[in-house]
């Protein structure tokens, strides 16, 4: 019956630590009985790995069988509609996905004052789907890095940023008092991946945790 | 590759009304924070209003509480900015942003920089 069915117009990763997920845009004018065929092919092993048969969402979660992303060349994944005995030609994802199309997230922020720093203390993910000896910090072992960015609240859209090279850091709030809010943007300072900022910890700042010293 | 597209600017009397739209392709859109922005001549580009496309939640400037309503549609990966009780201090070239934010761990709104922009839309309220 060939390929009478469009192709999904668009095939693409979106990935965090241990948490692969791939999407496709639909066929135009699908029917309510389309659905999608995923296949996975691993580099180094040229041979395509039918995923699943018939999706109707728009993404699977692909985490289960690339949980070696982090140790292999990577993959490629294609999709094509299928609707009865009909199917289209796959459409293939553009590029390598591989441990550099990892977004990198932090877990957790952890907020505490003393003598008027805010100290931090950021969490690393841990995913539940991770093996047990990849950990975030055993995979990207070196120049791990983080943005800091800090806002005062109530206030407009205006933050003040900062560069760490440690999970622990302080910010000097200049006397000032109020609730202040923190986001964490890791990033791998040899690596291009890109990050993603945290949610926002914020912490009230009163009086009382100044020390006076003459 | 992820694009940004706005549309529903124009020119308006002082008190009007107008409805900007901004149409996301290229990526999944359940968790970003997408943001407007505006850049009037001569000033520097400015937040109007933030939603948080997981959880709704909506973040406004002073200048604009009251005024101006940010919105979603899900269904059509696009976000709105109603804008009523314009000024001609409102007249601007007004930008969607968005930021993808983390499934597993989730996200605020705003956020502190945004990766993916539009190429804008000229608003003009005159007096």
């Known amino acids: 019956h060939g390929t009478e069915l469009p192709s999904p117009p668009s095939v693409w990763f979106e990935a965090e630590f241990f948490h692969h997920i791939l999407h496709w845009t639909p066929i135009p004018n699908q029917s309510e009985s389309t659905c999608y065929e995923v296949a996975l092919l691993r580099y180094g092993i040229e041979s395509w790995n039918s995923i699943s048969n018939c999706s109707q969402t728009l993404s699977y979660d692909l985490t289960a069988v690339t949980l070696d992303l982090y140790h292999s060349n990577g993959y490629r994944a294609r999709v094509r509609a299928v609707d009865g005995s009909r199917h289209s030609n796959w459409t293939v994802t553009n590029t390598r996905f591989s441990v550099d199309e990892v977004t990198l997230t932090v877990g957790s922020v952890n907020l505490e004052i003393h003598n008027g720093f805010i100290l931090g203390k950021i969490q690393l993910p841990r995913p539940k789907m991770a093996p047990a000896n990849d950990t975030y910090e055993s995979i990207f072992s070196h120049f791990r890095e983080y943005e800091i960015a800090i806002r005062k609240v109530p206030g407009n859209f205006t933050f003040t940023h900062k560069k760490v090279k440690h999970e622990n850091f302080s910010l000097l709030t200049s006397g000032e008092v109020g609730e202040f809010c923190v986001q964490v943007k890791p990033s791998v300072a040899s690596r291009s991946n890109k990050g993603m900022w945290s949610k926002e910890e914020c912490i009230s700042l009163t009086r009382q945790y100044f020390t006076v010293t003459n | 590759q992820v694009q940004l597209q706005e549309s529903g600017g124009g020119s308006v009397q002082a008190g009007g009304s107008l409805r900007l739209s901004c149409a996301v392709s290229g990526y999944s859109y359940s968790s970003n924070c997408m943001g407007w922005f505006r850049q009037a001549p001569g000033k520097e580009r400015e937040g109007v209003a933030t939603i948080h496309t997981g959880g709704g939640s909506t973040y406004y400037a002073d200048s604009v509480k009251g005024r101006f309503t940010i919105s979603q549609d899900n269904a059509k990966n696009t976000v709105y900015l109603q804008m009523n009780s314009l000024k001609p201090e409102d007249t601007a070239m007004y930008y969607c942003?968005?930021?993808?934010?983390?499934?597993?761990?989730?996200?605020?709104?705003?956020?502190?920089?945004?990766?993916?922009w539009g190429q804008g839309t000229q608003v003009t309220v005159s007096s």
């Open positions: 942003a968005a930021e993808p934010l983390s499934r597993l761990y989730g996200g605020s709104c705003p956020t502190p920089t945004f990766g993916y």
